[in-house]
């Protein structure tokens, strides 16, 4: 959808990019899967949620995630990732009061219970990629994306245009 230089220019201002409103502009309930059609699932274990990347059995129900879309004051790039010329950020919530967080120190993606207003670690820049895929870039760490590593979600640094379209940072959204 865009070259890496575009991404770097696009994301340079993310650290100081503020969200236009405290309220999402819209939300969408979807199942999240990898480029290779593995499902992202969430399991409650010892009073905390674990995130898994796994193949589901044929009739097994997929977990849903609520994507909440926010407008950023930072202008969007040319690739149509924004609304009304503004960049889109999302938060991802698989259940009430829990949100995906970027742990940049551990390079991990975690589920945390928290109240609004959400911390910056819960916000990801939404990129529309090829083949109806999306990717999620950390607001707190431009150039770092949610990706798949060893059957878990992890934070993956993207530093070249080849890596930008690498399958392990691409995800599919579907209603089923």
């Amino acid at each position: 959808a865009f070259g890496i230089s575009g991404v770097q220019k696009y994301t340079r201002a993310l650290h100081d990019s503020s969200i236009t409103g405290i309220s999402p502009i819209t939300e969408y309930l979807a199942s999240l899967s990898t480029y290779n059609d593995q499902s992202i699932t969430f399991a409650l274990e010892d009073e905390s949620y674990e995130i898994y990347v796994e193949d589901l059995k044929k009739d097994e129900k997929k977990d849903k995630v609520l994507l909440s879309y926010y407008e950023s004051q930072h202008p969007s790039n040319e690739s149509g990732d924004g609304v009304d010329g503004k960049m889109l950020m999302v938060t991802l919530s698989p259940t009430k009061d829990f949100w995906l967080h970027a742990n940049n120190k551990e390079h991990s993606v975690e589920l945390h219970k928290c109240e609004k207003p959400l911390p910056d670690q819960a916000f990801f820049v939404l990129h529309n990629m090829h083949s109806n895929c999306v990717s999620f870039e950390c607001k707190t760490d431009p150039g770092v994306f949610i990706g798949v590593k060893d059957n878990h979600l992890a934070l993956i640094k993207v530093d070249s245009s080849e890596n930008l379209c690498t399958e392990n940072i691409l995800f599919k959204l579907s209603e089923t």
Epitope: T26, L88, T95
Partner: antibody, heavy 128, light 108 residues
Framework: QLQLQESGPGLVKPSETLSLTCTVS??????????WGWIRQPPGKGLEWIGS???????YYNPSLKSRVTISVDTSKNQFSLMLTSVTAADTAVYYC????????????????????WGNGTTVTVSS | EIVLTQSPGTLSLSPGERATLSCRAS???????LAWYQQKPGQAPRLLIY???SRATGIPDRFSGSGSGTDFTLTISRLEPEDFAVYYC?????????FGGGTKVEIK
């Protein structure tokens, strides 16, 4: 710039079916993160939400009208439509189509909507 | 369903004055999912505010929204001639979404 335009007959006989179409220009229904919906306003009165739809075809209706309403989408034509059956004089109104933001309520597991871009509206009179 | 009551029904003011419109909900909602619309005669409504306080694209900053729980307010800091219209509040905290009955802001 996104624009919405309603079209359909301005006069419908009682007990018949009201059919309206909304054509979206300046943006694709399919690529949008938003929902689409219908709202009506009887003469001299307030606004009433009829229902909403996502491009996938998933629908959300006002319970007070649900038994009579069908909303559908045709992404190939960038249109969505309203059908209201068994109309009476009480269905006389200006009908608006609109783009909608959908927000989810975890407690009752339902979506609700606000409308950010509206069509100009079309007047539908129910009379014999 | 949530019933929204707007007051006053009519507000008579002069250009340059401050307008304060009230919207009260029959039940409290924590989300602040409340919108305000402006409607002029023969025209479609126009979104002014969503999320109780976020201005929609292209809306002048003289329009501001506030409130939470059951009580919400739309304020027009300094009325311009084009602001005389009917204003509706709408909740989208839960389905079905509902509108208030409207407040007409007219020239005094």
């Amino acid at each position: 710039q996104l624009q919405l335009q309603e079209s359909g007959p301005g006069l419908v006989k009682p007990s018949e079916t009201l059919s309206l179409t909304c054509t979206v220009s300046g943006g694709s229904i399919r690529s949008s993160i938003f929902y689409w919906g219908w709202i009506r306003q009887p003469p001299g009165k307030g606004l009433e939400w009829i229902g909403s739809i996502y491009y996938s075809g998933r629908t959300y209706y006002n319970p007070s009208l649900k038994s009579r309403v069908t909303i559908s989408v045709d992404t190939s034509k960038n249109q969505f439509s309203l059908m209201l059956t068994s109309v009476t004089a009480a269905d006389t109104a200006v009908y608006y189509c609109a783009r909608a933001g959908g927000l989810y309520n975890w407690n009752d597991e339902s979506f609700s909507f606000y409308m950010d871009v509206w069509g100009n509206g079309t007047t539908v009179t129910v009379s014999s | 369903e949530i019933v929204l009551t707007q007051s006053p029904g009519t507000l008579s003011l002069s250009p340059g004055e401050r307008a304060t419109l009230s919207c009260r909900a029959s039940q409290s909602f924590s989300s602040s999912y409340l919108a305000w619309y402006q409607q002029k005669p023969g025209q479609a409504p126009r979104l002014l505010i969503y999320g109780a306080s976020s201005r929609a694209t292209g809306i002048p900053d003289r329009f501001s929204g506030s409130g939470s729980g059951t009580d919400f307010t739309l304020t027009i800091s300094r009325l311009e001639p084009e602001d005389f219209a009917v204003y509706y509040c709408q909740q989208y905290d839960r389905s079905p979404l509902t509108f208030g009955g409207g407040t007409k802001v007219e020239i005094k």
